[in-house]
Interface confidence: medium
């Protein structure tokens, strides 16, 4: 709305940088062939690039990434009894970000 | 995968709490009747509840919210010239979070 301007602070751009995000650990990251199990924990924190850039046609992208393996519990319920196994999920953390030009493919003439 | 367990740290649950997120300011928040304008800044930071809860059938939800009006620029392009106007967008910040039971409607018998 265009009203109540007085009380409003000027909006500050969310700069392009790494922020803590929540990553849901989906079961198919652990086992694509079986669905009869649970994963614990169901979500973890990751560092990801987000925010906006000062110009159009540029996008906030990761310029440096790091893969981080973490152990999760794979909990299979077999005959009403849980079987716990360790599984490794590899998370991707963004270490640095940059505003990168979006390359749009030129139409073939 | 179940391999390379040694190098992996145990995964830590992303607890239910407020985190800084990036909110894209869409044009229809400012003017639903007109699309011939740009908004600056295109995105801002907000505080939002995210993460997982320790138990089944519970979800991370905001328990306290605050509305925060911010001023943005509405940039209309008229005859190839920009016209700057002020507009107010009301953002929603989450101040506190809680793990809340998901009420699933019972089937009617």
């Amino acid at each position: 709305s265009l009203g109540s301007l007085a009380a409003a602070e000027p909006a500050v751009i969310a700069e392009c940088k790494t922020r803590t995000e929540v990553f849901q650990i989906s079961r198919n990251l652990i086992d694509r062939t079986n669905a009869n199990f649970l994963v614990w924990p169901p979500c973890v924190e990751v560092q990801r690039c987000s925010g906006c850039c000062n110009n159009r046609n540029v996008q906030c992208r990761a310029s440096q990434v790091q893969m981080r393996p973490v152990q999760v519990r794979k909990i299979e319920i077999v005959r009403k009894k849980p079987i716990f196994k360790k599984a490794t999920v590899t998370l991707e953390d963004h270490l640095a970000c940059k505003c990168e030009t979006i390359v749009t493919p030129r139409p073939v003439t | 995968s179940l391999g390379s367990l040694a190098a992996a740290e145990p995964a830590v649950i992303a607890e239910c709490k407020t985190r800084t997120e990036v909110f894209q300011i869409s044009r229809n928040l400012i003017d639903r009747t007109n699309a011939n304008f740009l908004v600056w800044p295109p995105c801002v930071e907000v505080q939002r509840c995210s993460g997982c809860c320790n138990n089944r059938n519970v979800q991370c939800r905001a328990s306290q919210v605050q509305m925060r009006p911010v001023q943005v620029r509405k940039i209309e392009i008229v005859r190839k010239k920009p016209i700057f106007k002020k507009a107010t967008v009301t953002l929603e910040d989450h101040l506190a979070c809680k793990c809340e039971t998901i009420v699933t409607p019972r089937p009617v018998t």
């Epitope: 009894k81 360790k86 | 367990l5 145990p10 138990n55 089944r56 519970v58």
Partner: antibody, heavy 120, light 107 residues
Framework: EVQLLESGGGLVQPGGSLRLSCAAS????????MSWVRQAPGKGLEWVSY????????YYADSVKGRFTISRDNSKNTLYLQMNSLRAEDTAVYYC?????????????WGQGTLVTVSS | SYELTQPPSVSVSPGQTASITCSGD??????VHWYQQKPGQSPVLVIY???NRPSGIPERFSGSNSGNTATLTISGTQAMDEADYYC?????????FGGGTKLTVLG
């Protein structure tokens, strides 16, 4: 205050029965798995039985299978262990303990224990 | 049935590092927890999921687990750390405890 309080222990003859209770307070009992662990005099810890948050999953140590039954009443915040056909080797301090998750995990809260003596 | 083996006793001088081992077949494939029990008291969790410390447990307690052996390490051991220590793992549908290790702080 978060706590677990066991009761129901005592002296019982071999072949007899006993029902242990564990009253939980200070946390949402219905959200967590629970276990019973015992410790014979001068000996180490022995896990006895487990029950998930809603009671749908239960399992027992081989040494008590078929004789002991674990149950819970979430409306009363209470865990139970029904012990039948008791033997001298069941003599121990019985602890109830809380898991941090609905499915189990480590035991992050223990009661003070209740002594069960099986003797003629 | 699955067994966890601990040394019956470990002795350490105050200020030194104490290491208590827990061994079992492919133990590194399971999450190991450690409990401390002082005479006449209930057990207390000191390490969970191999290497995590619950709040309130001093930083001198640490843990590791790989291969067939999990280790509880107490650095800068204090007199108050004298107790029985039990490792535990959830394996094959049952929680298993090691036989326990009596830690004696000399002096």
């Amino acid at each position: 205050e978060v706590q677990l309080l066991e009761s129901g222990g005592g002296l019982v003859q071999p072949g007899g029965s006993l029902r242990l209770s564990c009253a939980a307070s200070g946390f949402t009992f219905s959200s967590y798995a629970m276990s019973w662990v015992r410790q014979a005099p001068g000996k180490g810890l022995e896990w006895v039985s487990y029950i998930s948050d809603d009671g749908s999953l239960k399992y027992y140590a081989d040494s008590v299978k078929g004789r002991f039954t674990i149950s819970r009443d979430n409306s009363k915040n209470t865990l139970y262990l029904q012990m039948n056909s008791l033997r001298a080797e069941d003599t121990a301090v019985y602890y109830c303990a809380k898991h941090p998750y609905w499915y189990g995990g480590q035991l992050d809260l223990w009661g003070q224990g209740t002594l069960v003596t099986v003797s003629s | 049935s699955y067994e966890l083996t601990q040394p019956p006793s470990v002795s350490v001088s105050p200020g030194q590092t104490a290491s208590i081992t827990c061994s079992g077949d492919s133990l590194g494939s399971y999450f190991v927890h450690w409990y401390q029990q002082k005479p006449g008291q209930s057990p207390v969790l000191v390490i969970y999921d191999d290497s995590n410390r619950p709040s309130g447990i001093p930083e001198r307690f640490s843990g590791s687990n790989s291969g067939n052996t999990a280790t509880l390490t107490i650095s800068g051991t204090q007199a108050m750390d004298e107790a029985d220590y039990y490792c535990s793992a959830f394996t094959h549908n049952s929680d298993v405890f090691g036989g326990g290790t009596k830690l004696t702080v000399l002096g």
